[in-house]
């Protein structure tokens, strides 16, 4: 008899954020006994698409040649072998960059911090938002959310961060996004560097995984402290 | 916690046979495709076979192909290597591995000896 | 059959270095590559599969680039744990062949 078939591993790449106009190529992994390979997009007609296995069998390719509005959303697949469909994978979620103009980025009071102290990056938009989110380059946990209440629509948001660590140092980017929808994003800032010196209590170098990765056991999440500014905006982890 | 055991190994003589298991537990062992890996002392790794979930496929590299038989039992949750007309260079260290794309588990391996 | 070639195979590097060791194919295998680390008397584990996807448990120091025939494992910063041999693998077609390895040694 049997067991339930295994949930299949879905992936994109070059990544899972990708700028508008390029192209993406999402993978769906399952076993030698696949015959078919079926991809289901949220809130659009099932099955988005099928496919038959590449050789040998275990995996199938989902080919978007052009990045658009359309594609960006929650994907999940599933595979048919001799006794049935699997479990659908785990979702990935394919988000488009370049959807709004490029928020400006700055650090307060200043990009170089010295280790135990504060500091607040500010992310700013041309047209107001209700989503902001900060991504560290390299970080296991990339993005930090600030969203709006209410649907008020905000120009800026602050991340503070307190008391700063060596983990902090690196080079950030930020966007903005409106809550209609979480997979259409700005293009993204130009880049900041945070500098941190000093730090003789966190010897620990800054974590080094890509975004869109698993987190390995050494990772450390960017945890900025402190309230938030602009009664309405709520900080999410996503 | 998936665990993968590997038995059966021991010294051979040349053309002699061999039945090596494998014990799976901690997955659900019928939905998943098998491979056996060997490993001269000193050498590189080289794959030996592979079995389909419910077993209906296997493949062999032709440096074993009619002279390995890979199987499973999906009820008692075991992997199999028949080897028959062994040679010296078959001694090695023996792998059994959860196929998952890669390999994603492997045993700790067991030891075949083929010498006069 | 499809040769993989690493390269270097061997390697003598320092805690803190980065490091980078290149597989090559014989011919294209799209993102079918994975990468293993082994340690002497040990089974070998698996460290970045298809090309560059990365795997729970594994430190983060570790990745994987590449498409095509060529591909790359990449150590950001050595640890004293991470002196191993390294294997890439193919799984594009039958036969399923292993690179010959790359010692990594300490300098």
């Known amino acids: 008899q049997a067991g339930p078939l295994p949930k299949p591993t879905l992936w994109a790449e070059p990544g899972s954020v990708i700028s508008w106009g390029n192209s993406v190529t999402i993978w769906c992994q399952g076993t030698l006994e696949a015959r078919e390979y079926r991809l289901d997009k949220e809130e659009s007609p099932a099955p988005w698409d099928r496919q038959n296995p590449l050789e040998p069998k275990n995996k199938a390719r989902f080919s978007i040649p052009s990045m658009t509005e359309d594609y960006a959303g929650r994907y999940r697949c599933y595979y048919r072998s001799p006794v049935g469909w699997s479990q659908p994978s785990d979702p990935l979620e394919l988000v488009m960059t370049g959807a709004y103009s490029k928020p400006t980025l700055s650090a307060l009071p200043s990009p170089l911090v010295t280790s135990g102290k504060s500091v607040t990056l500010l992310c700013q938009s041309r047209s107001p938002m209700d989503t902001f989110l900060l991504i560290k380059e390299r970080a296991a946990h990339p993005l930090l959310h600030l969203r709006s209440e209410h649907g008020a629509q905000q120009h800026q948001a602050e991340f503070p961060m307190s008391p700063v660590t060596s983990v902090h140092g690196g080079t950030y980017r930020c966007f903005s996004s409106h809550g209609f929808s979480h997979y259409l994003l700005s293009h993204p800032s130009d880049p900041l560097e945070l500098i941190v010196s000093g730090s003789l209590e966190d010897p620990r170098p800054s974590p080094t995984r890509s975004v869109s990765t698993a987190a390995g056991p050494e990772d450390q999440p960017l945890m900025p402290t402190g309230s938030v500014p602009h009664s309405g905006l709520r900080r999410h982890w996503e | 916690e998936v665990q993968l055991v590997e038995s059966g190994g021991g010294l051979v003589k040349p053309g002699g046979s061999l039945r090596l298991s494998c014990a799976a537990s901690?997955?659900?062992?019928?939905?998943?495709?098998m491979s056996w890996v060997r490993q001269a002392p000193g050498k590189g790794l080289e794959w030996v076979s592979t079995?389909?979930?419910?077993?209906?496929?296997?493949y062999y590299p032709d440096s074993v192909k009619g002279r390995f038989t890979i199987s499973r039992d999906n009820a008692k949750n075991s992997l199999y290597l028949q080897m028959n007309s062994l040679r010296a260079e078959d001694t090695a260290v023996y792998y059994c591995?959860?196929?998952?794309?890669?390999?994603?588990?492997w045993g700790q391996g067991t030891l075949v000896t083929v010498s006069s | 059959d499809i040769q993989m070639t690493q390269s270097p195979s061997s390697l003598s590097a320092s805690v803190g270095d980065r490091v980078t060791i290149t597989c090559r194919a014989s011919?294209?295998?799209?993102?079918?590559l994975h990468w293993y680390q082994q340690k002497p008397g040990k089974a070998p584990k698996r460290l970045i599969y298809?090309?560059?996807q990365s795997i729970s448990g594994v430190p983060s120091r570790f990745s994987g680039s590449g498409s095509g025939t060529e591909f790359t494992l990449t150590i950001s910063s050595l640890q004293p744990e991470d002196f191993a041999t390294y294997y890439c693998?193919?799984?594009?077609?039958?036969?399923?062949?292993f690179g010959q390895g790359t010692k990594l040694e300490i300098k």
């Open positions: 591995a959860r196929l998952w794309g890669a390999m994603d588990y």
């Open positions: 901690g997955f659900a062992f019928s939905s998943y495709d």
């Open positions: 079995i389909s979930s419910s077993g209906s496929y296997t």
């Open positions: 011919q294209g295998l799209t993102n079918d």
């Open positions: 298809y090309a560059s």
């Open positions: 693998q193919q799984s594009n077609s039958w036969p399923f062949t």
